[in-house]
């Protein structure tokens, strides 16, 4: 992989420890928490980033209505188990032996159970809806300009192939970005929509994961876009399995 040779850092992941101990003295970077080697030429998987975060010291124009099966990450942070490729393991458990099943973005998709809980496969999140509310601006945003700028951002900053940005909707002050990526569409080397969405989410919160970059400056024809709130909905290829008790709560 390519880490910055001169000062041996990982441009795409600040939560790494890098040293010139790779083959031929090349710079090699390992994720905090897991110690796994990461490819610094692309985004690091969300699972490894969450693990690193938990190990770090604590310091048409119409909007889309999320499907009834859409998941929102209400559980927040946890220390995940990642497989050897850095993906989330289908079953996650905490220190008190409470277990649950997650999707490919690490969001819980079943009720919590005990160690006997089975999660047969890692269900893929194939559709992500990012719902943003922007701050009032002095100048209005043109929909097509906004669309182009957000597509450019995902292509250039997050290295996500343009075909995976399905749509950008805008009804002031709400912006919705739809990312779609089926298992069959994702080729080797393609950035996962879940990873791109996570990097974007952290950028929007002012917690950039990129090494040495300032905060994300997103402008539409020079007019800065500032985000007041973010909601992210995750849709899985197989609908989640929650009890009726949770659904009516």
């Amino acid at each position: 992989h390519t880490a910055a040779q001169d000062n041996c850092t990982c441009p795409t992941n600040k939560m790494t420890v890098c040293s010139p101990d790779g083959p031929g003295g090349r710079c090699q970077c390992r994720a905090l928490g897991s110690g796994m080697a990461v490819d610094c030429s692309t985004l690091t998987s969300k699972c490894l980033l969450l693990k690193a975060r938990m190990s770090a010291p604590k310091n048409a124009r119409t909007l889309v209505r999320p499907s009834e099966h859409a998941l929102v990450d209400n559980d927040g942070l946890y220390d995940p188990d990642c497989d050897p490729e850095g993906r989330f393991k289908a079953r996650q458990c905490n220190q008190t032996s409470v277990c649950w099943c997650v999707n490919s973005v690490g969001v819980r998709r079943t009720d919590k159970g005990d160690l006997s809980l089975r999660c047969d496969e890692l269900v893929r999140t194939h559709h992500i809806l990012i719902d943003l509310r922007h701050r009032p601006t002095a100048g209005a945003f043109n929909h097509s300009d906004l669309d182009a700028e957000l597509r450019r951002l995902f292509r250039e900053r997050y290295r996500l192939h343009p075909k995976f940005v399905a749509a950008v909707h805008y009804e002031q002050p709400t912006i919705q970005i739809e990312l779609r990526q089926n298992t069959s569409q994702k080729a080797a080397g393609d950035v996962d929509i879940g990873d791109a969405a996570y990097y974007f989410e952290r950028d929007i919160k002012g917690e950039s994961l990129f090494q040495g970059r300032g905060g994300l400056d997103l402008r539409v024809r020079g007019e800065p876009l500032q985000v007041e709130r973010t909601l992210i909905y995750y849709l899985d290829e197989i609908p989640p399995k929650f009890s009726m008790k949770r659904l009516t709560a």
């Epitope: 002095a138 919160k205 002012g206 300032g214 905060g215 400056d217 997103l218 024809r221 020079g222 985000v227």
Partner: antibody, heavy 122, light 106 residues
Framework: QVQLVQSGAEVKKPGASVKVSCKAS????????INWVRQRPGQGLEWMGW????????KYNEKFKGRVTMTVDTSTSTVYMELSSLRSEDTAVYYC???????????????WGQGTLVTVSS | EIVLTQSPATLSLSPGERATLSCSAS?????IYWYQRKPGQAPRLLIY???NLASGIPARFSGSGSGTDYTLTISSLEPEDFAVYYC?????????FGQGTKVEIK
């Protein structure tokens, strides 16, 4: 550190034009807009407009539209403000100031250039 | 255009005293920015997004407010704080500044 250095004082006759330059250093020039603000003697601050060097986008105060032109030279990290059809009431100190912003905050006008005194007199 | 009215026009205080400067907008704005200007110098940003201290600005400066009424407070005046203070809005074009409040030594 971030710095804006403006061109020197100018004396112009009514009806003439003036072009003030503002050279930026210490940051990625294309990453923030450059605003122009003037202060007439004994008066407050008056915003004239901004230009965004990355794509050349501009926003002018309607009061100066047709008389003000902002341009950018990315090769030298310099922004220019030209004011035409000068009259005596355009006598003022003209400042350039950069505005940094992220998706989290608008950081205001900071820093400012040292100012350029433009005197319009017959 | 949004008119910002600052009061008082002049504030006469002694070093060590508390200064409270007001900025009233003709229509609701989301955020206000405060600048300090000394004779012969360029303005300097003090507060951005209503209440955030700009880089290098001492903690004795603070900002607050919402809607149409905003305040800049200097908790204990230092000799170098005697200057003219301006508020500014970024809510709609044209961007506008208040006419300024002069803080002078009593």
């Amino acid at each position: 550190q971030v710095q804006l250095v403006q061109s020197g004082a100018e004396v112009k006759k009514p009806g003439a034009s003036v072009k003030v330059s503002c050279k930026a250093s210490g940051y990625t020039f294309t990453s923030s807009d450059i605003n122009w603000v003037r202060q007439r003697p004994g008066q407050g601050l008056e915003w004239m407009g901004w230009i965004y060097p990355r794509d050349g986008s501009k926003k002018y105060n309607e009061k100066f539209k047709g008389r003000v032109t902002m341009t950018v030279d990315t090769s030298t990290s310099t922004v220019y403000m030209e004011l035409s059809s000068l009259r005596s009431e355009d006598t003022a100190v003209y400042y350039c100031a950069t505005r940094f912003a992220t998706v989290v905050s608008n950081y205001g006008l900071d820093p400012w250039g040292q100012g350029t005194l433009v005197t319009v007199s017959s | 255009e949004i008119v910002l009215t600052q009061s008082p026009a002049t504030l006469s205080l002694s070093p060590g005293e508390r200064a409270t400067l007001s900025c009233s907008a003709s229509s609701s704005v989301n955020y206000i920015y405060w600048y300090q200007r000394k004779p012969g110098q360029a303005p300097r940003l003090l507060i951005y997004d209503t209440s955030n201290l700009a880089s290098g600005i001492p903690a004795r400066f603070s900002g607050s407010g919402s809607g149409t009424d905003y305040t800049l407070t200097i908790s204990s005046l230092e000799p170098e704080d005697f200057a003219v203070y301006y508020c500014q809005q970024w809510n709609s074009y044209p961007l506008t500044f208040g006419q300024g409040t002069k803080v002078e030594i009593k």
